[in-house]
């Protein structure tokens, strides 16, 4: 891909003197890795993001870039440093031959190198030419707070900021980083160039068809007139936002990324850094009718990833494709025939569809929530978005069978009141990636930094698994699931909750020798049981053991198969109380569920007994689901009896704090 000026004249031939005294060897014992987009047509060979190790200073980045140029020049290669990153990720963007990758990977401070790739606007059609006025009465929707304390950054195409729907609401920054349009005869028509961004700005904050009518926006141009951008341009845009935030700290920031490209380690890393700096990022899941985890920034765990549904709450079909799905999607939102500002004229409206429109809805809702409660953290905001969503309204048959259990059945909704949800104990379910089928394969599910892991479960479609356990990793608990010999792989399922001032620990009992089964309880004063896990080393837990029933009056105890080690998650937090709720079915059943009552939140979900015909247990909203192998293969013996065990908690402390505020 050529420079904007169309040639390589400006490429630097670095001077030999530049490399005097510089060793070529990388830092001892580290190997930098090379990454590129899995989707070949989206690759942009010749431009590379060189990511340096976390603590690298700007001066070191510049020195490393100069060293690369010098060493390349010595080999007769031209290179051009296009940008030096700092503030978000240390590193630099370089235009060079792929022949130099081996050399670049050996440079000191280099963590990894990623080939640049394309990202795309996620709306279809680009412009329908269908101009329509807003189709509802304006007074039907008058939100209590229009998001006036929040700034929403939009990384998109250029926009028509003086459109009647958004005039005065959008500040067009001077940031622009876009690739040349494809095709020699491409005609830049202003209204087409502005189409995508103008529509989304209208969906977020438009006067008449916007979600957060009071939100102010800032736009950065990272997509060209064809709706195409680059990972590197998006990275530089995110860095621009971070620098703006440092120079002039304002109130809460929401960043809307209505674009998608192939999986990108560096784009995900940049999103993580920005999120950890207190910025809320919302992105489109993608319009590829595919697993969102294969795309970026949709696959970044710190980003709120939004799929698209229609007016009937069904997943949106877009031509032969449609909304993405899977465990990387946080929730869905309206994304079909969404009316918003059209750049065709200053008073025009147009209908567009896609996960971009869905993400814009959620960005608007987020702006309103943050305006009402500016101190909300990203974790708190995400939990609230999930909590207030419409549950179980999407027809899951649209999704591929193996993705149904992983895809959240949630459609974003505005909270009935933007205040007063503080007393709730919020929890969400986080699925790991699939472990893969090897005998010792494991899968790990993690909670966000300010969430507590309150329980851990596992699931395998083949039923061949060796359970799960909670373990410490980098000072935080994670949920690890274990595959078994002959298994097709497992998922780990973490129950991640907001529990301020919590002190949680895991108590483990090794496999019992006696036939009564293994049991473990929370013995520390003031600690309550929030979840039970079991893990076993044997390939197949005995299926003919009688099911173990919990002795009455033992609410703080986990019980399990005598050949399994049992893990109890025990937590102490102000006012936290929990209870165990069980639902057992004597006859074999493919699915057994138990739900927590109103006012209580599901923190733990497990199955009794943990025998091999149980595929696993997982939480769906406030319901514990235990899945077993097909009844026809199990027969109706006693081994088919399964009990779903839910642990339901609430926090009296949060309730009291909320009442004091009101």
């Amino acid at each position: 891909q050529e420079d904007e000026d169309g040639d390589y004249e400006e490429l630097v031939l670095a001077l030999r003197s530049e490399e005097d005294g510089l060793a070529e060897a990388p830092e001892h014992g580290t190997t930098a890795t090379f990454h590129r987009c899995a989707k070949d047509p989206w690759r942009l060979p010749g431009t590379y993001v060189v990511v340096l190790k976390e603590e690298t200073h700007l001066s070191q980045s510049e020195r490393t870039a100069r060293r690369l140029q010098a060493q390349a020049a010595r080999r007769g290669y031209l290179t051009k440093i296009l940008h030096v990153f700092h503030g978000l990720l240390p590193g630099f963007l370089v235009k060079m031959s792929g022949d130099l990758l081996e050399l670049a990977l050996k440079l000191p401070h280099v963590d990894y190198i990623e080939e640049d790739s394309s990202v795309f606007a996620q709306s279809i059609p680009w412009n329908l030419e269908r101009i329509t006025p807003p189709r509802y009465r304006a007074d039907e929707y008058q939100p209590p707070d229009g998001g006036s304390l929040v700034e929403v950054y939009l990384l998109d195409t250029s926009i028509q900021s003086d459109h009647r729907e958004i005039e005065g609401r959008v500040m067009v920054t001077d940031f622009e980083n876009v690739p040349e349009e494809d095709g020699t005869r491409f005609h830049r028509q202003a209204s087409k160039c502005d189409s995508h961004g103008t529509h989304l700005a209208g969906v977020v904050s438009g006067r008449d068809a916007g979600v957060a009518k009071g939100a102010s926006m800032r736009s950065l141009r990272v997509l060209n007139c064809q709706g195409k951008g680059t990972v590197s341009g998006t990275l530089i845009g995110l860095e621009f936002i971070r620098k703006s935030q440092l120079v002039q700290p304002v109130g809460p920031l929401v960043v809307l990324l209505p674009l998608a490209g192939g999986y990108s380690r560096v784009l995900n890393a940049a999103c993580q850094r920005l999120a950890r700096a207190g910025v809320v990022l919302v992105t489109a899941a993608g319009n590829f009718r595919d697993d969102a985890c294969l795309y970026s920034p949709a696959s970044a765990p710190e980003v709120i990833t939004v799929g698209a549904t229609n007016a009937q709450d069904q997943p949106v079909t877009l031509g032969t494709l449609g909304t993405n799905f899977g465990r990387c999607v946080d929730l869905f939102a309206p994304g079909e025939d969404i009316i918003g500002a059209s750049s065709d004229c200053s008073t025009c409206f147009v209908s567009q569809s896609g996960t971009s429109q869905a993400a814009a809805h959620v960005a608007g809702i987020a702006a309103m929530m943050l305006s009402a409660e500016p101190e909300l953290t990203l974790a708190e905001l995400r939990q609230r978005l999930i909590h207030f969503s419409a549950k179980d309204v999407i027809n899951e048959a649209w999704f591929p069978e193996d993705q149904r259990v992983l895809t959240p059945n949630l459609v974003a909704a505005l909270p009935p009141s933007t205040h007063g949800a503080g007393w709730q104990l919020f929890c969400r379910t986080v699925w790991s990636a699939h472990s893969g089928p090897t005998r010792m394969a494991t899968a790990v599910a993690r909670c966000a930094p300010d969430e507590e892991l309150l329980s851990c479960s596992s699931f395998s479609r083949s039923g061949k698994r060796r359970g799960e356990r909670m373990e410490a990793q980098g000072g935080k608990l994670v949920c690890r699931a274990h595959n078994a010999f002959g298994g097709e792989g497992v998922y780990a399922i973490a129950r991640c909750c907001l529990l301020p001032q919590a002190n949680c620990s895991v108590h483990t009992a090794p496999p019992a020798e006696a036939s009564m089964g293994t049991r473990v309880h929370c013995h520390q004063q003031g600690h309550v049981l929030t979840g039970c896990s079991s893990h076993w080393e044997v390939e197949d837990l005995g299926t003919h053991k009688p099911p173990v029933l919990r002795p009455r009056g033992q609410p703080n105890q986990c019980v399990g198969h005598r050949e399994a080690s049992i893990h109890a998650s025990c937590c102490h937090a102000p006012g936290l109380e929990c209870k165990v709720k069980e639902h057992g079915i004597p006859a074999p059943q493919e699915q057994v569920t138990v739900a927590c009552e109103e006012g209580w939140t599901l923190t733990g979900c497990s199955a009794l007994p943990g025998t091999s015909h149980v595929l696993g247990a997982y939480a769906v909203d406030n319901t514990c689901v235990v899945r077993s192998r097909d009844v026809s293969t199990t027969g109706s013996t006693s081994e088919g009896a399964v009990t779903a065990v839910a642990i339901c908690c609430r926090s009296r402390h949060l309730a009291q704090a909320s009442q004091e505020l009101q």
Epitope: Q160, V172, K213
Partner: antibody
Framework: QVQLVQSGAEVKRPGASVKVSCKAS????????ISWVRQAPGQGLEWMGW????????NYAQKVQGRVTMTTDTSTSTVYMELRSLSSDDTAVYYC????????WGQGTTVTVSS | QSALTQPASVSGSPGQSITISCTGT?????????VSWYQQHPGKPPKLMIY???NRPSGVSIRFSGSKSGNTASLTISGLQAEDEADYFC?????????FGGGTKLTVL
Amino acid sequence: QVQLVQSGAEVKRPGASVKVSCKASGYTLTSYGISWVRQAPGQGLEWMGWISVYNGNTNYAQKVQGRVTMTTDTSTSTVYMELRSLSSDDTAVYYCARGYGMDVWGQGTTVTVSS
Amino acid sequence: QSALTQPASVSGSPGQSITISCTGTSSDVGGYNSVSWYQQHPGKPPKLMIYEVSNRPSGVSIRFSGSKSGNTASLTISGLQAEDEADYFCSSYTSTSMVFGGGTKLTVL
């Protein structure tokens, strides 16, 4: 501060044309268009149209369509409104205002059409 | 003939509250959130007092408030003061343009 400064009063003969200017300052010009509104003596306000400073697009009121032309000169941050084929009915104070929201107004330009 | 209908005049004594109505149709006032109110003193340009139905620009007294029900918008001025005596105009978006009311002369007795 945000300001719109208009050109001075004009006296025109019927059938002639008038061109009124409006110089904007104190804000990001491309974030707002400019509306033109007129007020005949002792009468109410009448919206004449709007022009985009961003791309020059216009939106004219039906009543004056064909007789009015709005233009911009971004180098001087000035917007112009030209009205042709003047008649005594066009005698009015002509205002420019910021955007469709019309939150800031020029001081007004009196145009008198008299034979 | 103005598209939006306002009473020609209203009056009130200092300290009282008055309300000026602005009636349109579902194609203007009823269909959009963008109803504005302007105050105009003789020989001066109009001044924006309320925008988007009920929002007050900075610098405008809290005595001025706006509301809307169906196709009718209202401007209420509480604690009437002598300097409030002026002409008041409402405006609204239509699908492609803007319309004003005929104006209401407020007299402070």
